[in-house]
């Protein structure tokens, strides 16, 4: 499944939210929508 990140400090991995430390800007991919900074 897709993996992508939110700039509020968590990422979706295997369709669940888990916390991570770094932030990723929206220049790293397409905006997913209806999230906080989710890009893929």
């Amino acid at each position: 499944d897709a993996e992508f990140r939110h700039d509020s400090g968590y990422e979706v991995h295997h369709q669940k939210l888990v916390f991570f430390a770094e932030d990723v800007g929206s220049n790293k991919g397409a905006i997913i929508g209806l999230m906080v900074g989710g890009v893929v």
Epitope: S8, Q15, A30, I31, L34
Partner: antibody, heavy 121, light 111 residues
Amino acid sequence: QVQLVQSGAEVKKPGASVKVSCKASGYTFTTYAIHWVRQAPGQGLEWMGFTSPYSGVSNYNQKFKGRVTMTRDTSTSTVYMELSSLRSEDTAVYYCARFDNYPRGYVRDYWGQGTLVTVSS
Amino acid sequence: DIVMTQSPDSLAVSLGERATINCRASESVDNDRISFLNWYQQKPGQPPKLLIYAATKQGTGVPDRFSGSGSGTDFTLTISSLQAEDVAVYYCQQSKEFPWSFGGGTKVEIK
């Protein structure tokens, strides 16, 4: 202005495949994922998945896994949703959509006009 | 998967009166103090339109009579003074986790 324009209605036999297109304009194509949502006649909304025009990565609703494929063509700013092994229950209007992320200000959504896919023998 | 349940299925309200629609999630749709809960309006023959996002925030161009409340698993959409153009089906949706899921919809009619 942002526009998502979908391909026309389709009639398919059970077991066949259908490929619906969604052509984006009015913004930089690679900056927003495109989602697909379907609606059976008189029924509610069902999220099918999305694809990223930036990376080509897709995320599918497990309900459709193995039957749905979402792709993009960056040269024409078009996203495709192909559904295979069609059955009568797949008769629905299929929408493509684009959403903003939650910001501090506002969120906009943009939808295609919908494509009716009828599965009938 | 998160299951979204709406009530009632349909609602008849007099013009100018308040309409209230409820939505319950099978598990919390909150994360980092944000509720990933959205409301849509769909009129016949049209695609859905985002009314409310993050449980309480109004979408672009949405009239002030539409408001959302709630957190965790229980949410409410309120139309403070029903207008004729508000006749539609309303859906809640969670975007906390994939697969995104919608409630079954609530049809709002004029009494």
